[in-house]
Interface confidence: low
């Protein structure tokens, strides 16, 4: 079958690194400087990305394989293959169109991207506050007092706030 | 009572993906964040990313950022971890394990799925 | 990352004595820290969250103890059920990491 395809179609033969040359017989060229192509048959190498500015390189462009970027320190990417970089906030802030706020009281972030969640609201499964929340941390939920016989304890406090996402930092 | 119940060992080559199964029961699927955590034979356990069913809410490790795909079916109380692009070094037992919240710990787990990774 | 340093790597000890492993953050934790126990060839089990906090149906000679960087977990008279690997895990940040272990056999 392979062989009988490449008869058929001669790019099929040239393998990722390289494109199809329709200007010189079909014959497989290097991709130029400066650009990639990842897949074996290809027409056209594509132009490889310029980390630039807030970006920075964290993998170069090889024939084969296209730039990858991150952000400088005190940004973090957003979106699929890092395309924005956004402020770092402190943790117990958040980012909003006027830079970076504290958190309400009642909320926390424990990263340095994301949003200010609520803390743990451990009363509505009839659990105590072991440990009170702050700008930057949950509050710790303990034992209900039913629950404190010797050598036992829940660890399951109700309502649970959002894990704030990971910073690639 | 809580059950985490995983799907069954795999056996791969080098290059392909695998996706582990966990389905949970005895608690409400969607108020907790199921989390995936291997451990190589021999070695320590490793945390891969987890996900809240409730909206779906991913969180990985760098590490297995560009391999890893965690995602959650709230119809049937499942989530799943699918790896890709594996490796012999990806041989390794697959766990599921529960947490509430972020700081609290993982108190149930999966019994463990078996991915052996070979040419 | 925060990295969790664990010691010693494993320990031979008498039924009846007093065991102690040791867990170091690379950083601050505050009191953001849990402890499995993982018998051969089993799950990994719940033993301690919240540094000293025991989890439902665990020995009371199990304890947990610490705060920021250096944490302790001390079995006061080891039990021939207790020969296991010990973890540590910090809660504190994303992403969650564990120490490498603690191997505990019986002399």
């Known amino acids: 079958f392979e062989r009988t395809r490449s008869l058929q179609d001669p790019c099929s033969n040239c393998p990722a690194g390289t494109f199809c040359d329709n200007n010189r017989n079909q014959i497989c060229s290097p991709c130029p400087p400066n650009s990639f192509s990842s897949a074996g048959g290809q027409r056209t190498c594509d132009i490889c990305r310029q980390c630039k500015g807030v970006f920075r390189t964290r993998k170069e462009c090889s024939s084969t394989s296209n730039a990858e970027c991150d952000c400088t320190p005190g940004f973090h990417c957003l979106g699929a293959g890092c395309s924005m970089c956004e402020q770092d906030c402190k943790q117990g802030q958040e980012l909003t169109k006027k830079g970076c706020k504290d958190c309400c009281f009642g909320t926390f972030n424990d990263q340095k991207r994301g949003i200010c969640r609520p803390w743990t609201n451990c009363s509505l499964d009839g659990k105590s506050v072991l440990v009170n929340g702050t700008k930057e941390r949950d509050v710790v939920c303990g034992p209900s007092p039913a629950d404190l016989s010797p050598g036992a304890s829940s660890v399951t406090p109700p309502a649970p706030a959002r894990e704030p996402g990971h910073s690639p930092q | 009572q809580v059950q985490l119940v995983q799907s069954g060992a795999e056996v791969k080559k080098p290059g392909s993906s695998v996706k582990v199964s966990c389905k949970a029961s005895?608690?409400?699927?969607?108020?907790?964040?199921i989390n995936w955590v291997r451990q190589a034979p021999g070695q320590g356990l490793e945390w891969m990313g987890n996900?809240?069913?409730?909206?779906?809410?991913?969180n990985y490790n760098q590490k297995f950022k560009d391999r890893v795909t965690i995602t959650a079916d709230k119809s049937t109380s499942t989530a799943y971890m699918e790896l890709s692009s594996l490796r012999s070094e990806d041989t390794a037992v697959y766990y599921c394990?529960?947490?509430?919240?972020?700081?609290?710990?993982?108190?149930?787990w999966g019994q463990g799925t078996t991915v052996t990774v070979s040419s | 990352d925060i990295q969790m340093t664990q010691s010693p790597s494993s320990l031979s000890a008498s039924v009846g004595d007093r065991v102690t492993i040791t867990c170091r953050a690379s950083?601050?934790?505050?009191?953001?820290l849990n402890w499995y126990q993982q018998k051969p060839g089993k799950v990994p089990k719940l033993l301690i969250y919240?540094?000293?906090r025991l989890h439902s149906g665990v020995p009371s000679r199990f304890s947990g103890s610490g705060s920021g960087t250096d944490f302790t977990l001390t079995i006061s008279s080891l039990q021939p059920e207790d020969v296991a690997t010990y973890y540590c895990?910090?809660?504190?940040?994303?992403?969650?990491?564990f120490g490498g272990g603690t191997k505990v056999e019986i002399k």
């Open positions: 394990a529960r947490l509430y919240y972020g700081s609290s710990p993982f108190d149930y």
């Open positions: 005895g608690y409400t699927f969607t108020s907790y964040w």
């Open positions: 996900i809240y069913p409730s909206d779906s809410y991913t």
């Open positions: 950083q601050d934790i505050s009191n953001y």
């Open positions: 919240h540094t000293s």
């Open positions: 895990q910090q809660g504190h940040t994303l992403p969650r990491t």
